[in-house]
Interface confidence: low
């Protein structure tokens, strides 16, 4: 049987580093394939070579392995605003990133979307825009932070969190709340 994935890691540890246990004969340790190649046939016996083949165009392996197939090269997600930083090679996947003055917002471990860094209009930059984090803005007096933009306190309603920041101004804003609120 092909081992369960957890078992496979345990069984690999029986062999020295850079080798793996033969799936049909656990007394044989075969040499892993170099990055850029994949396992075509297990080694026939002790001290004999593993049959590794180079990855075909459009596929890669980035580390020594005993994978039966190379991995398909990633394509940058244009609909997420991604751009290609470096092309796929046999031993390295495509590297995708964002344009200048953009940051990555990760929706999941492997999926990110590119967004423009906030410019902190009506405020100052507290922390510069990073690869994976938007600019952190501090707003000038008379403005409050909403979705990382400095918005005029005239748009602050008593029911919102901004009331603390806009307290001096809020008294001058009339008729913007329902009459039932206090």
């Amino acid at each position: 049987l092909v081992p369960h994935l957890g078992d496979r890691e345990k069984r690999d540890s029986v062999c020295p580093q850079g080798k793996y246990i033969h799936p049909q004969n656990n007394s044989i340790c075969c040499t892993k394939c170099h990055k850029g190649t994949y396992l075509y046939n297990d080694c026939p016996g002790p001290g004999q070579d593993t049959d590794c083949r180079e990855c075909e165009s459009g596929s890669f392996t980035a580390s020594e392995n005993h994978l039966r197939h190379c991995l398909s090269c990633s394509k940058c997600r244009k609909e997420m605003g991604q751009v290609e930083i470096s092309s796929c090679t046999v031993d390295r996947d495509t590297v995708c990133g964002c344009r200048k003055n953009q940051y990555r917002h990760y929706w999941s471990e492997n999926l990110f979307q590119c967004f423009n860094c906030s410019l902190c209009l009506n405020g100052t930059v507290h922390l510069s825009c990073q690869e994976k984090q938007n600019t952190v803005c501090t707003c000038h007096a008379g403005f409050f932070l909403r979705e990382n933009e400095c918005v005029s306190c005239s748009n602050c309603k008593k029911s919102l969190e901004c009331t603390k920041l806009c307290l001096p101004q809020i008294e001058n804003v009339k008729g913007t709340e329902d009459s039932g609120t206090t």
């Epitope: 994935l5 392996t61 392995n65 994978l67 039966r68 197939h69 991995l71 398909s72 394509k75 492997n110």
Partner: nanobody, 119 residues
């Protein structure tokens, strides 16, 4: 959103055949190797079969080799598993999955289809 929808499971007698299908959507099907894994009642996951993105390479667990055939139709975004000479020990929930080759290699799973082999 990635979706994998398996079908074709059911009750079959020992020695019988079934063909499982997996309809894929929400990702570029042609880009990925695909696989089938199964989980027998009360047991862990077992890797059953795998097929490269262009269908030129296939791989089978020794327990199913010669009896099961994996295939794919990239024009229909569908993965198949033809299961012949079924045995009681093939009883399991069969999952279609996208193979990424990392140590958590099946990043996306379907909901599974139950295959019961019993007389």
């Amino acid at each position: 959103e990635v979706q994998l929808l398996e079908s074709g499971g059911g009750l079959v007698q020992p020695g019988g055949s079934l063909r499982l299908s997996c309809a894929a959507s929400g990702f570029t099907f042609l880009k990925y190797s695909m696989g089938w894994v199964r989980q027998a009642p009360g047991k862990g996951l077992e890797w059953v079969s795998q097929i490269s993105n262009t269908a030129d390479r296939t791989y089978y667990a020794h327990s199913v080799k010669g009896r099961f055939t994996i295939s794919r139709d990239n024009s229909k975004n569908t993965l198949y598993l033809q299961m012949n000479s079924l045995r009681a020990e093939d009883t399991a929930v069969y999952y279609c999955a996208i193979y990424t080759g990392r140590w958590a290699p099946f990043e996306y799973w379907g909901q599974g289809t139950l295959v019961t082999v019993s007389s």
